[in-house]
Amino acid sequence: LQDPCSNCPAGTFCDNNRNQICSPCPPNSFSSAGGQRTCDICRQCKGVFRTRKECSSTSNAECDCTPGFHCLGAGCSMCEQDCKQGQELTKKGCKDCCFGTFNDQKRGICRPWTNCSLDGKSVLVNGTKERDVVCGPASAGFSPGTSSVTPPAPAREPGHSPQ
């Protein structure tokens, strides 16, 4: 015998209280596949989330982050404050990258400049807080282990939330 619920399309649920007929999902709920016995509650976009896609009877709402924040995790499960290029997020807020490190994005951490000498090259363009160094061909009389700034990796305590 075929399960009568298998005939219920996406956007409906198989209503046990009404002889297993297919009922439309109630407001603020959805079913993305057929044959469902319940509809799922739509995701709400509150706090620093904003609605990227409204919920429909067949698909969940999607959230992204309000300006000044970016998404973390699958499906934008959390938001994190943006910083400027040349900064990283610490527990005390956005801080400039230490000398010898850079960040070319509004998120993430400051990373050490490339050590050109490790590849037998010299520094063609100096690094900044926002940009990595550009390595060029080795200069005459180059001996490995010179012609490069190698700063210590910065100690970090990432993370800060707007209060």
């Epitope: 989330f49 995790g73 499906g75 993370g159 939330s161």
Partner: antibody, heavy 119, light 107 residues
């Protein structure tokens, strides 16, 4: 089945530090936020801070800033909470808790670790 | 930080409806969760995102959140529901706040 298993009870002297661990099993570790919540005897729950292991992002409640450090080791699926400059008021049960992926609820909790601060 | 205020205690007769409130500035703009905690045990999530029930939580538990108040409602309260209940809010970032807790007594 997700499980959070915490390290054992600790007795500490005032002024010292304590580091409590929370090992996760049975689920993806790096994409879920792990929070630390404490409860002093007869008192309520207090959120201390949290971390998203896969992003290295940590954040702390204002009350604990500068005294708490939360870290995570993805290779062992373990989160850590270190509290320094301990005082008697820090005597409490410390819980780790995992945030559900897309919502704000802590759906899994560790068993709790009692930290006693006494001279 | 938003501050969450709960009544210290609520009493209810068995079979009746218990309502536990949680108030804070514009709380309805944020996500509210509720936890049940029995003596000597870790808290258990009973409501998340204002009104959603995790699997395994009885249907008698429901939640709402609008304006400045979130409410946990337990209809047909049973003796086993006697516990401490905590509200919690989340703004979407890695930041959470708990209310002070409410002791529910089933008379």
């Amino acid at each position: 089945q997700v499980q959070l298993v915490q390290s054992g009870a600790e007795v500490k002297k005032p002024g010292s530090s304590v580091k409590v661990s929370c090992k996760a099993s049975g689920g993806t570790f790096n994409s879920y936020a792990i929070s630390w919540v404490r409860q002093a005897p007869g008192q309520g729950l207090e959120w201390m801070g949290g971390i998203i292991p896969g992003f290295g992002t940590a954040n702390y409640a204002q009350k604990f800033q500068g005294r708490v450090t939360i870290t995570a080791d993805e290779s062992t699926s373990t989160a850590y909470m270190e509290l320094s400059s301990l005082r008697s008021e820090d005597t409490a049960v410390y819980y780790c808790a995992r945030k559900n992926e897309e919502d704000g609820g802590f759906d899994h909790w560790g068993q709790g670790t009692l930290v006693t601060v006494s001279s | 930080d938003i501050e969450l205020t709960q009544p210290p205690s609520v009493s209810v007769a068995p079979g009746q409806t218990a309502r536990i409130s949680c108030s804070g500035d514009n709380l309805g703009d944020y996500y509210a969760s509720w936890y049940q905690q029995k003596p000597g045990q870790a808290p258990v999530l009973v409501i998340y995102d204002d009104s959603n029930r995790p699997s395994g939580i009885p249907e008698r538990f429901s939640g709402s959140n609008s304006g400045n108040t979130a409410t946990l409602t337990i209809s047909g309260t049973q003796a086993e529901d006697e516990a401490d209940y905590y509200c919690q809010t989340w703004d979407g970032t890695l930041h959470f706040v708990f209310g002070g807790g409410t002791k529910l007594t089933v008379l």
